[in-house]
């Protein structure tokens, strides 16, 4: 592969990019080291962390992160105001709620300030990168003699934006039974055996109405219902992480 200096797009891809290309070289120059990828997640729409693998740099380098939104009043990049560090080297940026626009294309630029030609621009759909908090306040109630209802709460995110994965099992089950619940933070189990002890847990994701996040939240704290008889082989039915 030959190296080639080209002038790149003026939209946001500031000029004089050094690229590797298989086309005939116009200007020969040493290829630059690729920058690490930036990965961003929006945590419960409260803050966003954009991180990179700083240890992939051959020398300790304080890379800088700038960002903007595709459609905004001020089309210029702004520098990260709250860097995250790993071994005293920048490895991420935390962006606060007031700077998060879920439904605008997020443009993020990582740059080596010592070598301005070492620069990578990525575009991200933030609505697909939301990770909710684990569901909270799981409560069980009897709808009838054998019917149970499980309810829970999610903080800061509209219920209609979330999809839930409910898992339950009894002390006689080797594996979880699981099902998807859309938008409604409740689930009913039509038939329970009062001689069994049941465990329930829930997690959520920002999908599919308001975004298409594939990332599930952490599991809720488990809740239990039913007989407190000693399990025959407790180790066999230990709660999985």
């Amino acid at each position: 592969w030959s190296s080639k200096v080209l002038m790149s797009s003026a939209n946001e891809d500031i000029k004089a990019d050094l690229i590797l290309t298989s086309t005939a070289p116009e200007h020969l120059s040493a290829p630059t080291l690729p920058l690490p990828e930036v990965q961003c997640f929006v945590f419960n729409i409260e803050y966003m962390n954009c991180t990179w693998n700083s240890s992939s740099e051959p020398q300790a380098t304080n890379l800088t992160l700038h960002y903007r939104y595709k459609v905004s009043d001020n089309n210029t990049f702004q520098e990260c105001s709250h860097y995250l560090f790993s071994k005293e080297i920048t490895s991420g940026c935390q962006i606060q709620k007031e700077d998060i626009q879920l439904y605008q294309t997020f443009v993020v630029q990582l740059q080596d300030p010592q070598k301005p030609q070492r620069r990578a621009v990525q575009k991200l759909n933030l609505q697909n990168l939301v990770i909710p908090r684990a569901p909270e306040n799981l409560t069980l109630s009897n709808l009838s003699e054998s019917q149970l209802e499980l309810r829970w709460k999610s903080r800061h995110i509209k219920e209609r934006c979330l999809q839930y994965l409910v898992q339950y099992r009894s002390n006689r089950d080797r594996s979880w039974t699981e099902l998807i619940v859309n938008h409604e933070p409740r689930f009913s189990l039509p038939s329970v055996d009062e001689l069994k002890r049941y465990t329930f847990r829930v997690r959520s994701r920002y999908n599919p109405i308001c975004g298409s996040s594939q990332q599930w939240s952490k599991w809720s704290q488990p809740v239990h219902w039913g007989s407190h008889t000693v399990e025959e082989n407790p180790s066999l039915f230990a709660l999985e992480a």
Epitope: W1, L6, S8, S9, N11, E12, D13, D17, L18, I19, L20, S22, T32, P34, L35, E37, V38, Q39, C40, V107, Q109, Q117, R119, A120, V121, Q122, K123, L124, N125, N128, L129
Partner: nanobody, 126 residues
């Protein structure tokens, strides 16, 4: 070694359509960020459409709604469907690939792409 070969360019009238193809050999594109770029005479190279392997696709403002990026991993091929072509779309169109770790990585900076095709000429007459 990865080779990218573009095809599908040509001379068309304003308002017509073209479909560009880019076939890769040497490695799978299934875990690559992909980009279509163009270079018009006297202008800088600019991105036209970029895509992460997770499926997020972004377009340059002037082509949004007219151009569509797609990929067929089974054929190791990416496409650029160009509709309602305009004279200002005249350029050499390049396909580019960047192996990435994350499904969400889509690069609009040309220096982020490791592999490039030789380009295919698209000319739109008025």
């Amino acid at each position: 070694q990865v080779q990218l070969v573009e095809s599908g360019g040509g001379l068309v009238q304003a308002g017509d359509s073209l479909r560009l193809s880019c076939v890769a050999s040497g490695r799978t594109l299934s875990r690559c960020a992909m980009g279509w770029f163009r270079k018009a005479p006297g202008k800088e190279r600019e991105y036209v459409a970029i895509s992460s392997w997770g499926g997020d696709t972004f377009y340059e403002d002037s082509v949004e709604g007219r151009f569509t990026f797609s990929r067929d991993n089974a054929k190791n091929t990416v496409y650029l469907q160009m509709n309602s072509l305009r004279p200002e779309d005249t350029a050499v169109y390049y396909c580019a690939a960047a192996p990435t770790s994350f499904a969400t990585t889509a690069y609009s900076s040309s220096n982020s792409y490791a592999y490039w095709g030789q380009g295919t000429q698209v000319t739109v007459s008025s």
